[in-house]
Interface confidence: medium
């Protein structure tokens, strides 16, 4: 069986900074290397906008949670038909292929299955799904996700969420 894990599920970065989304997998059949697929899905709700109106969000999310949907994350869980879905990159053996939308971007799959952005861009905020596919190993949980939130800094003032404190930017 395949078991896919994203060890750090939640990343906040500043625009143009690098970030790596880690993904690890274990599989019972190791005769052939699996295909690693990273997909992007836009947030079902706007993470950043919600942070500026917590009261209304509280009411809405509490109502959703009260419905008793196990493990429901309203930012992540919705039908693909109501959000943007793209393939970011795939890796088979040592060959990494970027999806059409990401051609020209400095993005790659490093290690076995880690997705690395050398520079984040405005449209990168969303949910990233790491999928590991093997024809020899079809059982198990072959997918896990991480949330990425890219926030900007204007010349006047940082575009921050309430409670954040901006530190020095690294080169």
């Amino acid at each position: 069986a395949i078991q896919v894990t994203v060890p750090d599920p939640y990343h906040v970065v500043i625009l143009f900074q690098p970030v790596t989304l880690h993904c690890t997998y274990q599989m019972s059949n190791t005769l052939t290397a699996p295909i690693v697929i990273w997909k992007y899905k836009s947030f079902c709700r706007d993470r950043v906008a919600d942070a500026f109106s917590p009261a209304s969000v509280d009411n809405q999310l509490n109502a959703q949670l009260a419905a008793g949907n196990p493990g429901y994350n309203p930012y992540v869980e919705c039908q693909d038909s109501v959000r943007t879905v793209r393939v970011v990159a795939t890796k088979q053996g040592n060959a990494v292929t970027l999806g059409d939308y990401y051609q020209g971007r400095r993005i790659t799959i490093t290690g076995n299955a880690d997705l690395t952005f050398e520079q984040t861009a405005w449209g990168d905020s969303g949910v990233y799904y790491c999928s590991v596919v093997s024809a020899q190993d079809l059982d198990g949980n072959n997918e896990a996700y991480a949330e990425l939130i890219v926030l900007g800094r204007t010349s006047e003032a940082p575009e921050l969420l309430p409670g954040f404190r901006a530190g020095p930017l690294e080169d």
């Epitope: 750090d8 939640y10 942070a51 309430p162 409670g163 954040f164 690294e170």
Partner: antibody
Framework: AVTLDESGGGLQTPGGALSLVCKAS????????MNWVRQAPSKGLEWVAG????????DYGAAVKGRATISRDNGQSTVRLQLNNLRAEDTATYYC????????WGHGTEVIVST | ALTQPASVSANPGETVKITCSGG????????YGWYQQKSPGSAPVTMI???NNRPSNIPSRFSGSLSGSTNTLTITGVQADEAVYYC??????????FGAGTTLTV
């Protein structure tokens, strides 16, 4: 293996300042949020401060906000907590912890604030 | 703050469930962890992170699950697992928050 080693604890005087350092190894340090968590004697865990992988975001617990500064050196794989205007209630064991959903802890360093 | 029971008890071999609720209400509240502390002053050990992920050195009898806004640590077939178990979560922004701890008596 992931290891986190804290240092810098000891006896401190009220009103003074302390600097704790956590040295990390066994993983790509710059990819992970790092945190400081403390535990006062006979008390529970209290989140103190956090910093994201590239040093651009920091956040602090209410008890230390305005007195604490968290920073990191990704080249040296270290994260530092500076705590000023020390109070008796800062007496605790301070732990370094990795990740937004913490998956690894250091052994801790004990800080005693007393005259 | 996170809410968890002050204490639970079980006989060896029984299944124990410890619940944790009340994570950050609107931002980042969907990722919980469980941390075991065997004795005061000893370093916490991560039993579960990211809701249901178990570090490789943790026995498979420990598992985590998320249902609505409540996270549950399940210990199937309790052994010498007496300890204080803390739940933790992302509160708001990148800040963390912990429960007061649950003492498990076997």
């Amino acid at each position: 293996a992931v290891t986190l080693d804290e240092s810098g604890g000891g006896l401190q005087t009220p009103g003074g300042a302390l600097s704790l350092v956590c040295k990390a190894s066994g993983f790509t340090f710059s990819d992970y949020q790092m945190n400081w968590v403390r535990q006062a004697p006979s008390k529970g865990l209290e989140w103190v401060a956090g910093i994201n992988g590239r040093s651009s975001w920091t956040d602090y617990g209410a008890a230390v906000k305005g007195r604490a500064t968290i920073s990191r050196d990704n080249g040296q794989s270290t994260v530092r907590l500076q705590l000023n205007n020390l109070r008796a209630e800062d007496t605790a064991t301070y732990y370094c912890a990795r990740g937004s959903s913490i998956d690894a802890w250091g052994h801790g360093t004990e800080v005693i604030v007393s005259t | 703050a996170l809410t968890q029971p002050a204490s639970v008890s079980a006989n060896p071999g029984e299944t124990v469930k410890i619940t944790c609720s009340g994570g950050g209400s609107y931002y980042g509240s969907y990722y919980y962890g469980w941390y075991q502390q065997k004795s005061p002053g000893s370093a916490p050990v991560t039993m579960i992170y990211n809701n249901n992920n178990r570090p490789s050195n943790i026995p498979s009898r420990f598992s985590g699950s998320l249902s609505g806004s409540t996270n549950t640590l399940t210990i199937t077939g309790v052994q010498a697992d007496e300890a204080v178990y803390y739940c933790g979560s992302i509160d708001s922004n990148i800040a963390g928050v912990f429960g007061a701890g649950t003492t498990l008596t076997v």
